[in-house]
């Protein structure tokens, strides 16, 4: 795995990796602002549970299909996948904020982006999302909810915004009239939608429509919930690649220097090179690091 910008240069020298030649394709209540000195319960350190630990600026929304197309046992597997993913994210109001929504003919938010709870508590809440087993799970309704409720106001413009749409069913056509409009609305707000189709009844037509709306909207199509665990690392890695590192704290003018910071080009501050499970956690916010890169096949 590549650990810095400098490594991309090295990779470029070894082999020319391109997919395109030049000339080719041309809602919780609002909170008071967080002061840097305020300590919240979620800031109390909980050690990383895995080698892969995504320390990025990211607002991530999990959208869980609550239809009867998933049995109750399969829904438990889906929740376990969400909890597993949450274990690999540096969840806090400063780094990765998460929301968890179960959708049926409406939407039920269990966790909001601004909820100030310890990561372990948020994982507990996610594990207790109730199985709805409804006849309908409306992707249009949940995307509308994501657009107008969760991302109605962009309060962290520096963070990437991603909706992970876990879908196992097809909504009736009458409900999907405004589907594309909502996906386009999310794109306008720079929200990336990542559909994860699960099982034989997932709406492939909608998945392809989502992919068509924005090049960042990468879909994952799985034959059953049993494949979620296999795909988890790839999904979380893709999400993390889309999110920026924290910018270094700004220095007062008299302290500002024009020298290159140690974490920029030097390898010494980047921590260990990462193997299959990349370690995205930096212990010091001032160490600037660009994400690992898997060499293109």
């Amino acid at each position: 795995e590549r650990g810095s910008l400098n490594d991309i240069f090295e990779a470029q020298k070894i082999e020319w990796h391109t997919s395109q030649e030049p000339g080719g394709l041309v809602v919780p209540p609002t909170d008071a602002p967080v002061s840097p000195t305020t300590l919240y319960v979620e800031d109390i350190s909980e050690p990383p549970l895995h080698d892969f630990y995504c320390s990025r600026l990211l607002d991530l929304v999990f959208l869980l299909d609550g239809s009867s197309r998933l049995s109750e046992a399969e829904f438990e597997v889906l929740k376990a996948f969400v909890v597993d993913m949450m274990e690999r994210l540096r969840i806090s109001q400063k780094w990765v904020r998460v929301a968890v929504v179960e959708y049926h003919d409406g939407s039920h938010a269990y966790i909001g982006l601004k909820d100030r709870k310890r990561p372990s508590e948020l994982r507990r809440i996610a594990s207790q999302v109730k199985y709805a087993g409804s006849q309908v799970a409306s992707t249009s309704e949940v995307l509308k909810y994501t657009l107008f409720q969760i991302f109605s106001k962009i309060d962290r413009p520096e963070a990437s915004r991603i909706a992970l749409l876990l879908m196992a069913s097809q909504e009736p056509q009458r409900m999907s009239r405004n589907f594309v409009r909502y996906v386009q609305g999310l794109k306008k707000k720079k929200v990336i939608v990542i559909p994860v189709g699960i099982g034989p009844h997932a709406n492939l037509k909608q998945i392809r429509l989502i992919e068509k709306q924005a090049p960042e909207n990468k879909a994952f199509v799985l034959s059953s919930v049993d494949e979620l665990e296999q795909q988890r690392d790839e999904i979380v890695s893709y999400l993390c690649d889309l999110a920026p590192e924290a910018p270094p704290p700004t220095l007062p003018p008299d302290m500002a220097q024009v020298t290159v910071g140690p974490g920029l080009l030097g390898v010494s501050t980047l921590g260990p090179k990462r193997n299959h499970h990349h370690h995205h956690h930096h212990h010091h916010a001032h160490i600037v690091m660009v994400d690992a890169y898997k060499p293109t096949k």
Epitope: I8, L25, S160, A214, P215, L242, A243, L264, V288, Y293
Partner: nanobody
Framework: QVQLVESGGGLVQAGGSLRLSCATS????????MGWFRQTPGKERELVAL????????DYADSVKGRFAISRDNAKDTVFLQMNTLKPEDTAVYYC??????????WGQGTQVTVSS
């Protein structure tokens, strides 16, 4: 429709400066690492400068370090390359490119930079 459009190239004397711009559309710009490449006839494209998503990290090819500066404006979906103390060997077609995850996904058409001695 994804587009990357470079501008700012031209003819300049050795020791002079140029500022290249690359305006993008059709992508969520802030989730792409951006790079500037250059290519001269018969040679492989060379990665010249690279900038991270937020713009807080940059890196450069040894041949341009201290002379070139890459920057980005995420509000305007644009990346820049400030080229100072230009040398005849900097003559090339300069391309901007957008990197998502592990691959360079999108490319501009290129802009010619010619440095005369």
């Amino acid at each position: 429709q994804v587009q990357l459009v470079e501008s700012g190239g031209g003819l300049v004397q050795a020791g002079g400066s140029l500022r290249l711009s690359c305006a993008t559309s059709g992508i969520i710009f802030s989730v792409y690492h951006m790079g500037w490449f250059r290519q001269t006839p018969g040679k492989e494209r060379e990665l010249v400068a690279l900038i991270s998503l937020s713009g807080s990290s940059t890196d450069y090819a040894d041949s341009v370090k201290g002379r070139f500066a890459i920057s980005r404006d995420n509000a305007k979906d644009t990346v820049f390359l400030q080229m100072n103390t230009l040398k005849p060997e900097d003559t090339a077609v300069y391309y901007c490119a957008a990197r998502l995850g592990s691959s360079w996904k999108y490319w501009g058409q290129g802009t010619q930079v010619t440095v005369s001695s």
